[in-house]
Structures are given as structure tokens and as C-alpha cells.
């Protein structure tokens, strides 16, 4: 399977809520020795590696956030922990996996990764991430609502495999 | 503040099972998102991976020890545990359990107990 | 099994040195590797994670680079503390694998 980022770009108003979306691809093993573990983390532009680190969102680490199940099956977070501090990661039935952040400010503009891993008995990992840019702006020029941008066709099929 | 502390025998027979238990506080060791591994250290010598649990009860051993090692988990008393089998005095060694989140390194180490094995 | 190859395997520095530590992986694996510091006694201290990101209450004086096969850590100025043995491990694919360590010594 790979990691599709349908957006790349996010540009939202200071206020408003953003759903960042990351999208499963290919055959997903729904087989009883396999667990699927995702979660969503702010990272930097490395000059090697985009998402090698994993700096926490509004001060939830990757582990807080991550979501933890089997094959297409639907999760998301239902921690107390995530919702107080105006975050939810989800993921359905289609392979659709997303973070939502409410009431965004200044300081949420950044990097933001989503990593999908396969968990498989005696295996080892099969880790696959996406990368999108999230800018907030305030005043005159920031749009009415969040506008987003696609990735480019050779971006969403240069799927990143980490 | 999560600790592992390391526990049992510290002298093992040749061709006996060694076996080592590894008490978590300070968090659950059934929390999805984890590995609880084991690492030995002959003295004076490197470190060398023996295997990992996943918290969904998955294992991952060292094809080196695989024939001679388990690692098994109690939830209830939050412990893990490790045993190799037919010892020789070559596993002699300091056994450390450690943590590593999915897809990461070891980032939380018990302070390790040493396991002669010598008749 | 992914062999890890550190070098130098011992080093003399003083206080206030630039010290350099390599690694290499028999093949590639990304940016899958972490540095420790181990100091007599006592059990490995993570430093490094994928490669580059330096594990959270890590003086920044320690940095790592490489992705691939080749890797180095990196102490900017020695301090007193930072005499210990490092090690670089791969944690790519199972088995994982531990380089044979560098001691680092006072010159």
C-alpha cells in the first residue's frame, strides 16, 4: 500500500477548523496477524528526509494522536486529551485518514505528516507517510474560509514509502 | 515517568533456561503504539537485539537466539518477560528491556541485570 | 541481517573538541537509525532518532546526519559529560542491528 496526499497546501483563516486529509492506497491486507497503527505529527522540511521528525501538535506527540486497528476497519480518537485541545484524527472505511483542527491560530502554520504503518507478526514494519504545508493567516489579505490546494499528479503518484 | 526495572536470577547453569522479568510503572504495558523489547550486552562488549513484543501480542526475534528465545507478556501484572533456553556461558551478559514506539528507536531502557551462566 | 560499521572504534579528544563518529549500514536503510550513549554501568541513553532529530532533553551540541548507507554523529564542543561509548543502531527491518561502538576517551 501507499500514502496519497489528495492537498499539499492548507490556507486557512486565524479561527477557523481544517480537516487534513491523507488517503490509504492499494491492497490493504485485512488478515487477523496484521494491525494497521496511524497517526499525525508536525515535522520540517529536512533536507534528506521530509517527516523524519516528529515534533508534537499543539503539544500532543504522535503517540497521543495515533489510531490503532485492523484492515479498512474505522477509527478515530476518542481521547478526552486530543478533543481538549481541539484535535481529532479519524479513519474510514475507504482508506480516508484525516486530523481535524479546531479554532486555528498562528502557531498551528507548519509542517504536517501523517505515517501509516503495517504491523505484522514476525514482520517488519511497513511504514509509508504524506506531507502537506498548513499556513494560517490573519488580517485583510487571509481568505473567508480555508482554501486548498492540490498535489500535483507527479506529487500524489511520488508517493512517499518511508 | 515510565521506568522498567529488570528482575531474576543472576546466576543460570549451562543448558538451564534463563529467565527475566520486566516490571513497567509509570505507564501501561497493554498501551497500543508500543514494542517492549529485550537487549544483551556480553561485558565488555556490544549491544545485541534479542526480539520485541508488540502490544497487540506480536513477537520479533533475533534469528540468531529464535530456536531458544520467548517473550511473553502479563497485563495484569504489568510485566514482561524473557526466557532463553539451553544457556551456554556465551549469554552471559547484561539483559536490559527497553521500549521503542512504532516505527522508532529504543527510547526508554531498564537499568539492566546481569545473568552469569557458569556451573 | 543488516551489518552496522562504526569507526573509529575508539577516539582520544579534550574538552572543547570537535568530534566526528561514522557509521554504515551493509545496505541502505533510509533515515532508520538512532544514536545512544551508553557510560559505564549504566544502560544506553537515546540521543539521535531518524538520523537527524535529536531526541527531546538532548544538549544540541549532538547532531546527526547521512541518509542511506552512510551516517555520522557529530559533538560540537566536548564537555566533561560526553566521554562514553556510542553506538549506532538501524531499525529499517528485523534483525536490528547495533554497531560495535565507539569509546570515546579524554585525551
Known amino acids: 500500500f501507499k500514502v496519497a496526499t489528495p492537498y499539499s497546501l492548507y490556507v486557512c483563516p486565524e479561527g477557523q477548523n481544517v480537516t487534513l486529509t491523507c488517503r490509504l492506497l492499494g491492497p490493504v491486507d485485512k488478515g487477523h496477524d496484521v494491525t494497521f497503527y496511524k497517526t499525525w505529527y508536525r515535522s520540517s522540511r529536512g533536507e534528506v528526509q521530509t517527516c523524519s521528525e516528529r515534533r508534537p501538535i499543539r503539544n500532543l506527540t504522535f503517540q497521543d494522536l495515533h489510531l490503532h486497528h485492523g484492515g479498512h476497519q474505522a477509527a478515530n480518537t476518542s481521547h478526552d486529551l486530543a478533543q481538549r485541545h481541539g484535535l481529532e484524527s479519524a479513519s474510514d472505511h475507504h482508506g480516508n485518514f484525516s486530523i481535524t483542527m479546531r479554532n486555528l491560530t498562528l502557531l498551528d502554520s507548519g509542517l504536517y505528516c501523517c505515517l501509516v504503518v503495517e504491523i505484522r507478526h514476525h514482520h517488519s514494519e511497513h511504514r509509508v507517510h504524506g506531507a502537506m504545508e498548513l499556513q494560517v493567516q490573519t488580517g485583510k489579505d487571509a481568505p473567508s474560509n480555508c482554501v486548498v490546494y492540490p498535489s500535483s499528479s507527479q506529487d500524489s503518484e511520488n508517493i512517499t514509502a518511508a | 515517568q515510565l521506568q522498567l526495572q529488570e528482575s531474576g536470577p543472576g546466576l543460570v547453569k549451562p543448558s538451564e533456561t534463563l529467565s527475566l522479568t520486566c516490571t513497567v510503572s509509570g505507564g501501561s504495558i497493554s498501551s497500543s503504539g508500543y514494542y517492549w523489547g529485550w537487549i544483551r550486552q556480553p561485558p565488555g562488549k556490544g549491544l545485541e537485539w534479542i526480539g520485541s513484543l508488540y502490544s497487540s501480542g506480536y513477537t520479533y526475534y533475533n534469528p540468531s537466539l529464535k530456536s531458544r528465545v520467548t517473550i511473553s507478556v502479563d497485563t495484569s501484572k504489568n510485566q514482561c518477560s524473557l526466557k532463553l533456553n539451553s544457556v551456554t556461558t556465551a549469554d552471559t551478559a547484561v539483559y536490559y528491556c527497553?521500549?521503542?514506539?512504532?516505527?522508532?528507536?529504543?527510547?526508554?531502557w531498564g537499568q539492566g541485570t546481569l545473568v552469569t551462566v557458569s556451573s | 541481517d543488516i551489518q552496522m560499521t562504526q569507526s573509529p572504534s575508539s577516539l582520544s579528544a579534550s574538552v572543547g573538541d570537535r568530534v566526528t563518529i561514522t557509521c554504515r549500514a551493509s545496505?541502505?536503510?533510509?533515515?532508520?537509525l538512532a544514536w545512544y550513549q551508553q557510560k559505564p554501568e549504566k544502560a544506553p541513553k537515546s540521543l539521535i532518532y531518524?538520523?537527524?532529530s535529536l531526541q527531546s532533553g538532548v544538549p544540541s551540541r549532538f547532531s546527526g546526519s547521512g541518509s542511506g548507507t552512510d551516517f555520522t554523529l557529530t559533538i560540537s564542543s566536548l564537555q566533561p559529560e560526553d566521554f562514553a561509548t556510542y553506538y549506532c543502531?538501524?531499525?529499517?527491518?528485523?534483525?536490528?542491528?547495533f554497531g560495535q561502538g565507539t569509546k570515546l576517551e579524554i585525551k
Open positions: 545496505q541502505g536503510i533510509s533515515s532508520w
Open positions: 527497553a521500549r521503542h514506539p512504532v516505527a522508532m528507536n529504543f527510547d526508554d
Open positions: 531518524a538520523a537527524s
Open positions: 543502531q538501524q531499525y529499517n527491518s528485523y534483525p536490528y542491528t
